[in-house]
Interface confidence: medium
């Protein structure tokens, strides 16, 4: 067991190595190790193969170090890995696309304040095994076609707190059995028409926070599951073309966020629910 | 790292106000809800009151409705709670809890302010 | 009176896997969003649950939740004396803005 950590066999092998000031991974983890815990260290690069030997490893955590690279291939011959949380290393900035390859039964993957500013093409590639995906609090500006695509049971995307500023047509193609999404406290002022077409099994989606003057109710109507709508602090323009909005929101049966609209100035605070259809005059 | 620091608890009489703040740090303060919540001496938990990142929206329990005003300078990363007309059964540890993770959820807490409101 | 119902106390010993229960009407539990907290003693609650079923980042993964009609459940496995302490579950209302804790369940580890 390395110096700076404990390790012990019951419930699960785990070495725990968690605050202890270590600047590397430390060498002579045991192979049989189930569970890493090297979180809240100052751990900066994670190298190739560094745990490679833990071929029955689950849980790996390193979130809270200042890592600023991690090798493409440092979770090589992880195959049983289900939890990686590589949260709060703002220094980051961006991951290979193909850390992740490889990680067949990944369920829960943790990268939110990581500094991120792109998402690699196929990064999450083959990870058809995950549910659970943090991204929030990045430096995101894009959500490029089909980065989602592979993630058929993902259940729940963290998007939050990122510089989104449109969400186009194919940005979360393949989420067949999302639950949630938070796009909120972005800069999201464009929505396609087609861009949740997958999200027949949506429950929650929060849009508030964002640059949102108009969306299309197109958009809204694959959403058949879904039950909490969030649209709250936007630039909503109540004029001609938020008829459709309205019209949707009042047959909306699931419980919906004030959507007060900004113009024209003499409806400006007013809750686009509550109106009347004769109140959205003019384009 | 996510800190969130409570102060301006004391004793007070039945009858007198109380404002109560909530210094915050390590996180973009002015995207997220923040909430209070109190605990009486030897209870449970109960939410008090929150507020939208912006500061636009506000909600209370119906126990301080009226009393309580909740508000944020986002340009100090400070929540107060402004606490009028206090009773004895006001009397507990007040925490800020973050919204992180959206409204459903309290994801961070502070350590807490005790105010007794007592003759 | 909590609308949230909890068990007052829970017992176990180390090693056991030990559940606690949170129960209510259906548009408490089931149209809700459901929050499990940990308040060991002389410290603020902790999160280890929220979206019903969703680990907290950094807590163990001996803690799981579930939620089904009219109730809501936290296990914890492989118990530790650790564990002692207060439970909680929290159920909000997108909509309605309001938040509810259950009364909450004292574990205590023997």
């Known amino acids: 067991c390395p110096g700076a950590c404990v390790c012990y066999n019951e419930p699960k092998v785990t070495t725990s190595c968690p605050q202890q000031g270590l600047q590397a991974v430390p060498v002579g983890i045991p192979a049989a190790s189930q569970r890493i815990f090297l979180h809240g260290n100052r751990i900066s690069h994670v190298p190739a193969a560094s745990f490679r030997a833990c071929r029955n490893l689950t849980i790996l955590w390193l979130h809270s170090n200042v890592l600023a690279r991690i090798d493409a291939a440092a979770f090589t011959g992880l195959a049983l890995l289900e939890q990686l949380d590589l949260s709060d290393n703002a220094q980051l900035r961006s991951v290979d696309p193909a850390t992740f390859h490889g990680l067949g039964r990944l369920h829960t993957l943790h990268l939110d304040r990581c500094g991120l500013q792109e998402l690699g093409p196929g990064l999450f590639r083959g990870l058809a095994a995950l549910q659970y995906l943090y991204l929030q609090d990045n430096a995101l500006q894009a959500l490029p076609d089909d980065t989602f695509r592979d993630l058929g049971n993902l259940t729940h995307l963290f998007l939050h707190g990122n510089r989104i500023s449109s969400v186009p047509e194919r940005a979360f193609r393949g989420l067949h059995s999302l639950d949630r999404l938070l796009l909120h406290q972005n800069r999201v002022a464009h929505v396609h028409p087609h861009a949740f077409r997958d999200l027949g099994r949506l429950m929650t989606l929060y849009l508030f926070a964002n640059n949102l003057s108009a969306l299309p109710t197109e958009a809204l109507a694959p959403l058949r599951a879904l039950q909490y709508l969030r649209l709250n602090d936007n630039p909503w323009v109540c004029d001609c073309r938020a008829r459709p909005l309205w019209a949707w929101l009042q047959k909306f049966r699931g419980s919906s966020s004030e959507v007060p609209c900004s113009l024209p100035q003499r409806l400006a605070g007013r809750d686009l629910k509550r109106l009347a259809a004769n109140d959205l005059q003019g384009c | 790292e996510v800190q969130l620091l409570e102060s301006g608890g004391g004793l007070v009489q039945p009858g007198g106000s109380l404002r109560l703040s909530c210094a915050a740090s390590g996180f973009t303060f002015s995207s997220y809800a923040m909430s209070w919540v109190r605990q009486a001496p030897g209870k449970g938990l109960e939410w008090v009151s929150a507020i939208s990142g912006s500061g636009g929206s506000t909600y209370y329990a119906d126990s301080v409705k009226g009393r309580f005003t909740i508000s944020r300078d986002n340009s100090k990363n400070t929540l107060y709670l402004q606490m009028n007309s206090l009773r004895a059964e006001d009397t507990a540890v007040y925490y800020c809890a973050l919204h992180y993770y959206g409204l459903g959820s309290f994801d961070f807490w502070g350590r807490g302010t005790l105010v007794t409101v007592s003759s | 009176q909590s609308v949230l119902t909890q068990p007052p106390s829970v017992t176990g010993v180390p090693g056991q896997r030990v559940t606690i229960s949170c129960s209510g009407s259906t548009s408490m539990i089931e149209r809700a969003d459901i929050s499990w907290y940990q308040q060991l003693s002389g410290e603020a609650p902790k999160l280890l649950v929220f979206?019903?079923?969703v680990p907290s980042s950094g807590v163990s993964d001996r803690f799981s939740a579930s939620k089904s009609g009219t109730s809501a459940s936290l296990a914890i496995s492989a118990l530790r004396s650790g564990d002692e302490g207060d439970y909680y579950c929290?159920?909000?209302?997108?909509?309605?803005?309001?938040?509810?804790f259950g009364g909450g369940t004292k574990l205590t580890v023997l």
């Open positions: 979206a019903n079923v």
């Open positions: 929290a159920a909000f209302h997108d909509g309605l803005n309001d938040w509810v």
